[in-house]
């Protein structure tokens, strides 16, 4: 099942597993979403050469990818769990509408690609449970989402094909910052 | 050199109180979650509580909760727990312990306070 | 809560022999970690995620298994190895720990 099993969020444990706590419910939606991500990576590296190219700038200038940095306090370095927390959101949210562009981008593993899309809502619901009582999570303009997946859709095959590695890059990257955060909260 | 040192153990009779103390020292503190285990006599390890690196999140036991509180200081490198309606079932040795970074595993451990609840 | 059965309860064992030791969860679990305590100290981290080698843990110790059934195993025991062992899961809290093996010099 793309959704792994759950019902409402619960973080003082109780004496029986169902529901699960949040925490692993987190912890198992991004495991899985991740493993997804590895089957489309895997379809998208052997039908093109995009995951050993070097001209991955060339493309990454017209995306803004949402990237972890020292100031979103979600490394060990400088963690501040509020301020992560509030960063894995927003992030998760921008990341919606390049999820929204894979969708069509696969053959094989089209399945595979809607599941990551629909496991990614239900962990962003998940982590704002958890953030309740943080301050409003900002979410991204729908005019500008819809304008930029046009602007994607628009791009040649090749633009389109690196696009698509460097997505599934970034949010591989992001997810696997976010676990390793979201592990000591 | 890393290092989680207990104190604040003792004799106590039941329903009574008593706050553990953990120091920290040899590593940035603020960072890493925390958690308290125990160990009764002659017994297995059982774990207690967690606290998250800011304070926002902490996780109970089933056997402690709504009686044990964790807490701790940044600022001062320390981690606590409030121990109330104390049972003859809570004396054990008491260890903090510090969560790996970016893992559930409890890496670091103190030596232990000992608590025990008689009349 | 998951529960964790060890067997067996204890292992007689001379230095230099394998030693294996199991942990069994009434339910498939998420991480596993395994833990060596010698009387009078603190536990000390051997494996965690399964079968990850903690820093400073020697590549005599490894750990391995999935979902229900894990194992530890000392490829050739030192005589400071002989200690209780203890396994413990996260699978959401609470953590679970295992009723312990207690490996002692045959």
């Known amino acids: 099942a793309p959704v792994p099993p759950g019902e409402d969020s619960k973080d003082v444990a109780a004496p029986h597993r169902q529901p699960l706590t949040s925490s692993e419910r987190i912890d198992k939606q991004i495991r899985y979403i991740l493993d997804g991500i590895s089957a489309l990576r895997k379809e998208t590296c052997n039908k093109s050469n995009m995951c050993e190219s070097s001209k991955e700038a060339l493309a990454e200038n017209n995306l803004n990818l949402p990237k972890m940095a020292e100031k979103d306090g979600c490394f060990q370095s400088g963690f501040n769990e509020e301020t992560c927390l509030v960063k894995i959101i927003t992030g998760l949210l921008e990341f919606e509408v390049y999820l929204e562009y894979l969708q069509n981008r696969f053959e094989s593993s089209e399945e595979q690609a809607r599941a990551v899309q629909m496991s990614t809502k239900v962990l962003i619901q998940f982590l704002q449970k958890k953030a309740k009582n943080l301050d409003a999570i900002t979410t991204p303009d729908p005019t500008t989402n819809a304008s930029l997946l046009t602007k994607l859709q628009a791009q040649n095959q090749w633009l389109q094909d690196m696009t698509t590695h460097l997505i599934l890059r970034s949010f591989k990257e992001f997810l696997q910052s976010s676990l390793r955060a979201l592990r000591q909260m | 050199e890393v290092q989680l040192v207990e104190s604040g153990g003792g004799l106590v009779q039941p329903g009574g109180s008593l706050r553990l103390s953990c120091a920290a020292s040899?590593?940035?503190?603020?960072?890493?979650?925390m958690s308290w285990v125990r160990q009764a006599p002659g017994k297995g390890l059982e774990w207690v509580a967690k606290?998250?690196?800011?304070?926002?999140?902490?996780y109970y036991s089933d056997t402690v909760t709504g009686r044990f509180t964790i807490s701790r200081d940044n600022a001062k490198n320390s981690l606590y727990l409030q121990m109330n309606s104390l049972r003859a079932e809570d004396t054990a040795v008491y260890y903090c312990?510090?969560?790996?970074?970016?893992?559930?595993?409890?890496?670091?451990w103190g030596q232990g306070t000992t608590v025990t609840v008689s009349s | 809560e998951i529960v964790l059965t060890q067997s067996p309860a204890t292992l007689s064992l001379s230095p230099g022999e394998r030693a294996t030791l199991s942990c069994s969860a009434s339910i498939s679990v998420s991480y596993m970690y395994w833990y060596q305590q010698k009387p009078g100290q603190a536990p000390r981290l051997l494996i965690y995620d399964m079968s990850n080698l903690a820093s400073g843990i020697p590549a005599r110790f490894s750990g391995s298994g999935s979902g229900t059934d894990f194992t530890l195993t000392i490829s050739s025991l030192e005589p400071e190895d002989f200690a209780v062992y203890y396994c413990m899961q996260w699978s959401g809290y609470p953590y679970t720990f295992g009723g312990g093996t207690k490996v002692e010099i045959k």
């Open positions: 040899g590593f940035t503190f603020s960072p890493f979650a």
């Open positions: 312990a510090r969560q790996l970074w970016g893992y559930y595993a409890l890496d670091i």
């Open positions: 606290i998250s690196p800011g304070g926002s999140w902490t």
